[in-house]
């Protein structure tokens, strides 16, 4: 349940953070799960910990394997687990699947490429980006703080991003690389504030108790590819993935286009045996890009 | 106004089951961990339940494996579902909230109480 | 588990006169963070219980500077310097150190 996946190269730091939430004051202590044995938190170990964070310095192959942290609050101890993996480092330029971290995307207007995990480690700019394992070299790459800029991105921008940095500790310095997708969305037509088309504003639907309903968002963020538009329904003002209730489910947003060219979404919300409760809720349709935020209210009534 | 107001309670057979729900108001109900305690009439209270602000779910042997405590962040609700019910069940079923997990130095026990729901497992 | 005990059970006390309440752990209820997890409850009559002490001495807001909490480790005491009426009761103390555990409560009254 509490359990994270962290990975690494050989010969490079890797810091890793206890999946479960602490405070500051609290102690947290770590263990080799297979074994029980504790992790020392004296620096002069390869593997220590730290607080929340294990840090292998460097890490090794064979340190691959679930390590346990308990957080030592008063009350109730927290268990979390990493399940850490480190791989040889790869001797030709390919970046494996198993390497990568999430996928972003960009476009003209904007083009920030992250440095994965890079608030752990006690590094210092610049950083060193490679695309391809090319050093990025020229005016349109700039790097700011932990993130990458390209100016007046193209098509051709899209490739494996590697961030390159290094982790002091106590004097020493490691390496550390990250590797991450970029994809670059077509930026033909425009974009604009969005434009709810359903619900209206303050609309309230009639239901019957005991039956199923679907209530549907709709939305327009302007013409051609979008780099962000998404249409999403909240309860109470809340995300529906917080609202555990299993007969009230959001539809992955479908895209349309029209025959003018407009780009929209539609999210259909399904709320299956339709309860009092329901009732009560305040039902948003929200709709989002680069522009702003548009949020339509509806509210269910009981049919006479 | 910080609040908490359990309903659910009521007269139930024993082996029965009863849902007890607790209504959060006035502060981020998903920040802090919630509890139940119960208190037999004439008698001291009893911390019977427990989840944090991960999910994670706590009892004491005396009801673990018939009560089962669970959280509603958007509705900004805690439950108690209490199943084989016994006759020392019965008690005034308080809903309490505990530690703030945003506040790296809050804790304060439990320092906000419901005024309580009664259950009563009698034949 | 840690067992809470409470000394007296019952306490009649004199308006205007001081009370005090003894509460002691089975174990100490100092935490590795440097705080000791003992507080102070009063249930009135028909109500639910108010905090008045948490980490042994600090007031919870609202709480009367008549009342005031002392002690370490394993031996905690409540004082109340000088009882009115409206502090009738139960008092308990409570640990949350390992889980929760209350003291059996003790009752004052005015005499």
């Known amino acids: 349940k509490f359990s994270k996946q962290s990975w690494g190269l050989e010969n490079e730091a890797l810091i890793v953070r206890c999946p479960r939430q602490g405070k500051s004051s609290y102690i947290v202590d770590w263990y080799y799960s297979q074994t029980n044995k504790s992790i020392p938190t004296q620096e002069r170990n390869r593997v220590f910990a730290s607080g929340q964070l294990l840090k292998f310095l460097p890490a090794e192959v064979a340190d691959s394997g679930i390590y346990t942290c308990i957080v030592r609050s008063p009350t109730f101890n927290r268990t979390g687990y990493a399940n850490v993996t480190i791989y040889k480092k790869q001797p030709d330029c390919n970046v494996p699947d198993y390497l990568m971290y999430s996928t972003v995307s960009g476009s003209e207007k904007n083009s920030k490429i992250y440095c994965p995990t890079i608030d752990l480690y006690n590094w210092t700019a610049p950083l060193e980006w490679f695309k391809n394992c090319q050093a990025l070299q020229g005016s349109r790459y700039k790097a700011h703080k932990s993130f990458l800029v390209i100016d007046n991105v193209m098509t051709d921008d899209a490739g494996d991003y590697t961030c390159k940095f290094i982790h002091n500790e106590n004097g020493a310095n490691y390496s550390v690389t990250a590797t991450r997708s970029f994809t670059v969305k077509d930026e033909q037509g425009f974009s604009r504030f969005p434009v709810i088309r359903a619900p209206a504003h303050n609309e309230t639907k009639e239901v019957e108790i005991g039956e199923n309903t679907n209530l549907t968002c709709s939305a327009c963020f302007g013409k051609g590819a979008q780099f962000l538009a998404t249409v999403q329904w909240q309860l109470n003002g809340n995300k529906i993935t917080d609202f555990s209730e299993p007969r009230i489910q959001q539809e992955e947003g479908q895209n349309q286009s029209f025959s003018n060219g407009l780009a929209c979404v539609n999210t259909v919300l399904r709320i299956a045996d339709v309860k009092e409760e329901d009732l009560l809720l305040r039902y948003d349709c929200l709709a989002l890009n680069l522009h702003g935020l548009r949020r339509h209210t509806i509210r269910l009534s009981r049919k006479n | 106004e910080v609040q908490l107001v359990e309903s659910g309670g009521g007269l139930v057979q024993p082996g029965g089951s009863l849902r007890l729900s607790c209504a959060a108001s006035?502060?981020?109900?998903?920040?802090?961990?919630m509890h139940w305690v119960r208190q037999v009439p004439g008698k001291g209270l009893e911390w019977i339940s427990s989840?944090?602000?991960?999910?994670?779910?706590y009892y004491p042997g005396s009801v673990k494996g018939r009560f089962t405590i669970s959280r509603e962040n958007a509705r900004n609700s805690l439950y108690l579902q209490m199943n084989s019910l016994r006759a020392g069940d019965t008690a005034v079923y308080y809903c309490t909230r505990g530690e703030d997990w945003s506040d790296d130095d809050y804790y304060y026990g439990l320092d906000v109480w419901g005024q309580g729901t009664t259950v009563t497992v009698s034949s | 588990n840690i067992v809470m005990t409470q000394t007296p059970l019952s306490l009649s006390v004199t308006p205007g006169q001081p009370a005090s309440i003894s509460c002691k752990s089975s174990?100490?209820?100092?935490?590795?963070?440097?705080?000791?997890?003992l507080f102070w409850y009063l249930q009135k009559p028909g109500q639910p219980p108010q905090l008045l002490i948490y980490?042994?001495?600090n007031r919870f807001s609202g709480v009367p500077d008549r009342f005031s909490g002392s002690g370490s480790g394993t031996d905690f005491t409540l004082k109340i310097s000088r009882v009115e009426a409206e502090d009738v009761g139960v008092y308990s103390c409570?640990?949350?150190?390992?889980?929760?555990?209350f003291g059996p409560g003790t009752k004052v009254d005015i005499k």
């Open positions: 174990q100490s209820l100092l935490h590795s963070d440097g705080k000791t997890y």
């Open positions: 980490g042994v001495s």
């Open positions: 409570m640990q949350s150190l390992q889980l929760f555990t």
């Open positions: 989840i944090d602000t991960e999910g994670d779910t």
């Open positions: 006035g502060f981020t109900f998903s920040t802090f961990d």
